[in-house]
């Protein structure tokens, strides 16, 4: 039975040209995290494998930095980066947990972080 929950940074916004940290946290389970995939609307950005380390997809390697932790840092943001991001936790023996983050990249200098929220 899957008992864990994913806590994410929720809905966030950032300025064009700036950077943002995408962060998820898996709690309430003793399952072993084997891999975390970071995806943007069905496109794989990066994989953090417990044994193999980070694999950043080539088209993002110049502006995606691994970490902190299992999170992902997006740099040199453009308005095209606006959209949904998913952290997919592969765990053993529980299976897969998915968290969702919505990022809005703003032209203006006003960018505020949304509240944290949980997905069971």
């Amino acid at each position: 039975m899957m008992t864990g929950t994913i806590e994410t940074t929720g809905n966030i916004s950032a300025e064009k040209g700036g950077s943002i940290i995408l962060q998820c946290h898996l709690s309430s389970t003793t399952a072993q995290v084997t891999q975390v995939n970071w995806e943007q609307q069905d496109q794989l950005l990066a994989i953090c494998n417990a044994d193999l380390g980070w694999h950043i997809s080539p088209s993002f390697k110049d502006r995606v930095a691994p970490g902190p932790g299992l999170g992902l840092t997006l740099q040199s943001l453009t308005v095209n980066d606006t959209g949904e991001y998913f952290c997919i936790y592969h765990t053993y023996p529980d299976g897969t947990y998915t968290g969702r983050i919505f990022l809005e990249v703003l032209e203006s200098s006003v960018a505020e972080h949304g509240a944290r929220f949980q997905i069971p």
């Epitope: 994989i47 417990a50 380390g53 694999h55 390697k61 023996p93």
Partner: antibody, heavy 119, light 106 residues
Framework: QVQLVQSGAEVKKPGSSVKVSCKAS????????INWVRQAPGQGLEWMGR????????KYAQKFQGRVTITTDTSTNTAYMELSSLRSEDTAVYYC????????????WGQGTLVTVSS | EIVLTQSPDFQSVTPKEKVTITCRAS??????LHWYQQKPDQSPKLLIK???QSISGVPSRFSGSGSGTDFTLTISSLEAEDAATYFC????????FGQGTKLEIK
């Protein structure tokens, strides 16, 4: 086109070391990850380790830890694998595949380098 | 270490026949399973990634399925050029390969 060209066959004495090179063309190795996989005669495939040429970060299979060193020279777009303390069981074809764009699978392989360890 | 066990080890088949090769993992690996074809004296060639995702340039007769611990590579209608050894590989943990399945054409 995208390809990996490896150095030629080697014959080595037990206890010595071998260094195999893998030159990339058609892509920049800093944009991907280079792995080394070996195959003993008539046997299966065995992953040895990988390098992120952009950062120099390496990961090695436990079996080869302390005996294998993977490096790159990004100025020549070349990866290297050095295996030390050679024994007869290291006789194999050594391949340098690059990781696929979306994970730890191998989409382009070098032609292989036969390393023979014999006294 | 995750162990991958392929079956059969060897299969002799006739052209146009449907061929199924299985790969079983010693623990769940989600869909982190990839398939390769290796012909004699050649480097392996990627056929399928992530259990079922097709690869550009690979004939459509090759398909993959499965998740968790049980995976299948299917060749819908065998051709003479498909004589080769087929390997599965997992990327859920330290990278490991199956022992291989040799396909012979009758």
């Amino acid at each position: 086109q995208v390809q990996l060209v490896q150095s030629g066959a080697e014959v080595k004495k037990p206890g010595s070391s071998v260094k195999v090179s893998c030159k990339a063309s058609g892509f920049n190795i800093k944009d991907t990850y280079i792995n080394w996989v070996r195959q003993a005669p008539g046997q299966g495939l065995e992953w040895m380790g990988r390098i992120d040429p952009a950062s120099g970060d390496t990961k090695y299979a436990q079996k080869f830890q302390g005996r294998v060193t993977i490096t790159t020279d990004t100025s020549t777009n070349t990866a290297y694998m050095e295996l030390s303390s050679l024994r007869s069981e290291d006789t194999a074809v050594y391949y340098c595949p690059k990781s696929g764009d979306y994970g730890w699978y191998f989409d382009v392989w070098g032609q292989g380098t036969l390393v023979t360890v014999s006294s | 270490e995750i162990v991958l066990t392929q079956s059969p080890d060897f299969q002799s088949v006739t052209p146009k026949e449907k061929v199924t090769i299985t790969c079983r993992a010693s623990q769940s690996i989600s869909s982190n399973l990839h398939w390769y074809q290796q012909k004699p004296d050649q480097s392996p060639k990627l056929l399928i990634k992530y259990a079922s995702q097709s690869i550009s340039g690979v004939p459509s007769r090759f398909s993959g399925s499965g998740s968790g611990t049980d995976f299948t590579l299917t060749i819908s209608s065998l051709e003479a050029e498909d004589a080769a050894t087929y390997f599965c590989q997992q990327s859920n943990s330290w990278l490991t390969f199956g022992q291989g399945t040799k396909l012979e054409i009758k």
